[in-house]
Interface confidence: low
């Protein structure tokens, strides 16, 4: 029988880059406000975007159910077209992989089609990035 | 499309058990609370139970709270009332309902009596 | 526990007339969190419950754009417009704001 004490577990360096992020909440013509449950995450939420470290492919899933019909769009980059975009839903539920570098950022933008200006509220808003090439360019 | 099928109702002598299941096919069951809410014979709708999406948080009407426990199997889509102690006044159809911001998803409902 | 009070108990309305149901709860349904989380369900006989309006005003999918939600606090409003047979049933509010969540005792409209 063989036992592992704490000071033995070969530490698994450098941690797979991954973040899981949930919303509640997204402005009309703005974005989702993302939070970050977890103390723990090896990747950052900075000015409402994830910061990308680490070159390479990202597992990207996206849930959430709207409190009324929108479109949504997941941006990495200015000037760039959306990860991706869903029309005229009222919920979503996609996984994708997308190519990521250092120094992009992902970040939502939504808009309604209703005359009201309030905020979409937002039941299970949950996005996961995990990292698929770790060992990969990584810059802190 | 979305179903939610309700089984394990029966006819029991009071202060007999019984384990009611809910099974969910269509939506992201993992993402949303889960509901019992019951209806006696003729009468209007009563909460009963909800326990949270992760499966943390479990909440019950004081009538029942002691006597049922509500738990669900993410990895089973399922969720399913524990029903001690029954009393002739718990006879009554059980739904299970999923809430995003109302309980929009409801099951067919399963019928509980408990007589002697 | 938050009472929720539904007027009339029963309305008998001719087709293609406007309905109204009223409902009141015993202390204000405003969330902490901005939301007003009150509900309204039709039950057809011999069927479960389904939901029409949710967050006071807003159409559950596949709800017939002749329901209307309004209302805010403790005072609220169901309006059915150019009511068809179909629409017979048990009409009940629920709030959600506060547990345990409480239905009224219902309205049932009948069509002439």
């Known amino acids: 029988c063989l036992h592992f004490y704490a000071s033995q577990v070969p530490p698994q360096y450098p941690p797979i880059q991954s973040i899981r992020v949930q919303f509640t909440r997204c402005e009309n013509e703005k974005g989702c406000i993302i939070t970050s449950p977890s103390k723990d995450e090896t990747m950052k939420v900075q000015d409402n975007s994830i910061i990308i470290n680490c070159d390479g492919f990202y597992l990207i899933s996206l849930k959430g159910y709207f409190s009324e019909e929108l479109s949504l769009s997941l941006y990495y980059r200015k000037g760039r077209g959306p990860l991706f975009s869903l029309s005229k839903v009222t919920s979503v539920d996609s996984i994708g992989v997308a190519y990521l570098a250092f120094k992009d950022k992902v970040y939502f933008n939504v808009t309604t089609h209703s005359t009201s200006y309030k905020d979409i509220q937002v039941n299970g808003g949950e996005l996961i990035l995990i990292h698929q090439n770790p060992g990969g360019f990584c810059a802190y | 499309a979305v179903q939610l099928v309700e089984s394990g109702g029966d006819l029991v002598r009071p202060g007999g058990s019984l384990r009611l299941s809910c099974v969910a096919s269509g939506f992201t069951f993992s993402n949303f609370d889960m509901y019992w809410v019951r209806q006696a014979p003729g009468r209007g709708l009563q909460w009963v139970a909800t326990?949270?999406?992760?499966?943390?948080?479990?909440y019950s009407t004081d009538t029942v709270r002691g006597r049922f426990t509500i738990s669900r199997d993410n990895a089973r889509n399922t969720v399913y009332l524990q029903m001690n102690s029954l009393r002739v006044e718990d006879t009554a159809v059980f739904y299970c309902?999923?809430?995003?911001f109302g309980l929009g998803y409801w099951g067919q409902g399963t019928l509980v009596t408990v007589s002697s | 526990d938050i009472f929720m009070a539904q007027t009339p108990p029963s309305l008998s309305v001719s087709p293609r007339e406007t309905a109204s149901i009223s409902c009141k709860a015993s202390q204000s349904l405003l969330h902490s969190d901005g939301n007003t989380y009150l509900d309204w369900y039709l039950q057809k006989p011999g069927q479960s419950p389904q939901l029409l309006i949710y967050?006071?005003?807003n159409r559950f999918p596949g709800v017939s754009d002749r329901f209307s939600g309004s209302g805010s606090g403790t005072g609220f409003t169901l309006r059915i417009s150019r009511v068809e047979a179909s629409d017979t049933g048990v009409y009940y509010c629920?709030?959600?704001?506060?547990?345990?969540?409480t239905f009224s005792q219902g309205t049932k409209l009948e069509i002439k």
């Open positions: 967050l006071v005003s």
């Open positions: 326990i949270s999406y992760d499966g943390f948080n479990t």
């Open positions: 309902t999923a809430r995003r």
């Open positions: 629920g709030q959600g704001t506060q547990l345990p969540y």
